[in-house]
């Protein structure tokens, strides 16, 4: 499987909510000996590899925000901790995987990464990630609602296998 990022850039006004999305592509094993771990974190555009560094999102670590389930099952964070920080990550039956951030501030601007790991009994992890930029704007130049910019066809096909 691979991970696609439908949008590479989200430009939002301060105070707005946004949902960042990744999509799982390709065959997904639904066997009993496989588990999927999905999470979100902030990172920086490394010279060598984007998404290597794992920084917290609003003080919540990648472990605080992770989902853990089999196959294409639906899941979402029910953690009070995440919701108290205005965050919720979710995964549906169709391979879509998202994080919703409420009441955006300028401090939320930056690079966001989704990570999906297939964990299988007796096998090494299969790790894939996607990256997207969030720009939170204020003042007269800010849009009234979030504007999303699709990934180029090259980006969405040149999908990162970590």
């Amino acid at each position: 499987f691979k991970v696609a990022t439908p949008y590479s850039l989200y430009v939002c006004p301060e105070g707005q909510n946004v949902t960042l999305t990744c999509r799982l592509l390709g065959p997904v094993d639904k066997g009993h000996d496989v588990t999927f771990y999905k999470t979100w974190y902030r990172s920086s555009r490394g010279e060598v590899q984007t998404c290597s560094e794992r920084r917290p999102i609003r003080n919540l670590t990648f472990q605080d925000l992770h989902l853990h389930h089999g196959g294409h099952q639906a899941a979402n964070t029910s953690h009070d901790l995440a919701q108290r920080h205005g965050l919720e990550s979710a995964s549906d039956h169709h391979g879509n995987f998202s994080i919703t951030m409420r009441n955006l501030t300028l401090l939320d601007s930056g690079l966001y990464c989704c990570l999906v790991v297939e964990i299988r009994h007796h096998h090494s992890e299969h790790r894939v990630h996607g990256a997207m930029e969030l720009q939170v704007q204020t003042g007269k130049d800010a849009p009234s609602n979030c504007v999303v910019y699709p990934s180029s066809s090259q980006d969405s096909e040149n999908i990162t296998a970590a």
Partner: antibody, heavy 119, light 107 residues
Framework: QLQLQESGPGLVKPSETLSLTCTVS??????????WGWIRQPPGKGLEWIGS???????YYNPSLKSRVTISVDTSKNQCSLKLNSVTTADTAVYYC???????????WGQGTLVTVSS | DIQMTQSPSSLSASVGDRVTITCRAS??????LAWYQQKPEKAPKSLIY???SLQSGVPSRFSGSGSGTDFTLTISSLQPEDFATYYC?????????FGQGTKLEIK
């Protein structure tokens, strides 16, 4: 603050089974998204990964030891156990338990316990 | 198995020196490399993950770089507490493997 504490006999006879326990405090051993691993270090030598157990029960062993090793978890006691059978003097080492999150390295370690294999 | 080879195996340096330790993987491991510091009679401590990311609480004089097969750990200005043994570890695939270690001693 997560703490890991290894315990078990410090002396084991050749051909017998080495049994160690790692007791976890300050966190749940059944928390999803973590592996619980064992690493050993013979006196004056380097580190060797023995194996790891994922929170959902999946196990991963070093092929060099796979035929002799078993890692298991007791969630009721918040403990992870290592069993290594048919030991020889080459198994004399400091044994560490450690935790690593998914797709990450070992970020929390116990202080280690020395096990000597001798008759 | 992926073999990890560190060099040098030992190194003498003085407080204030800049020190570099290298680690080479026998096959590509992307950025799935960690560096640890170990002091006598103590457990290893994680310094760097993902080849170049600093573990929380680790002083900024430590830095890592590299990708694929060649990696380096750099200490920009040695402090007295930095004299220890350093290990690299790949966590790209099982079995996880460590370098043989580099012992950093006071000159």
């Amino acid at each position: 603050q997560l703490q890991l504490q290894e315990s078990g006999p410090g002396l084991v006879k050749p051909s017998e089974t080495l049994s160690l326990t790692c007791t976890v405090s300050g966190g749940s051993i059944s928390s999803s998204g973590y592996y619980w691993g064992w690493i050993r270090q013979p006196p004056g030598k380097g580190l060797e990964w023995i194996g790891s157990l994922y929170s959902s029960g999946y196990t991963y062993y070093n092929p060099s030891l796979k035929s002799r090793v078993t890692i298991s978890v007791d969630t009721s006691k918040n403990q992870c156990s290592l069993k290594l059978n048919s030991v020889t003097t080459a198994d004399t080492a400091v044994y560490y338990c450690a935790r690593h999150p998914v797709a990450m390295n070992f970020d929390d370690w116990g202080q280690g316990t020395l096990v000597t294999v001798s008759s | 198995d992926i073999q990890m080879t560190q060099s040098p195996s030992s190194l003498s340096a003085s407080v204030g020196d800049r020190v570099t330790i290298t680690c080479r993987a026998s096959q590509g491991i992307s950025s799935w490399l960690a560096w640890y510091q170990q002091k006598p009679e103590k457990a290893p401590k994680s310094l760097i993950y993902a080849a170049s990311s600093l573990q929380s609480g680790v002083p900024s004089r430590f830095s890592g770089s590299g990708s694929g097969t060649d990696f380096t750990l750099t200490i920009s200005s040695l402090q007295p507490e930095d004299f220890a043994t350093y290990y690299c570890q790949q966590y790209n695939s099982y079995p996880y493997t460590f370098g043989q270690g580099t012992k950093l001693e006071i000159k």
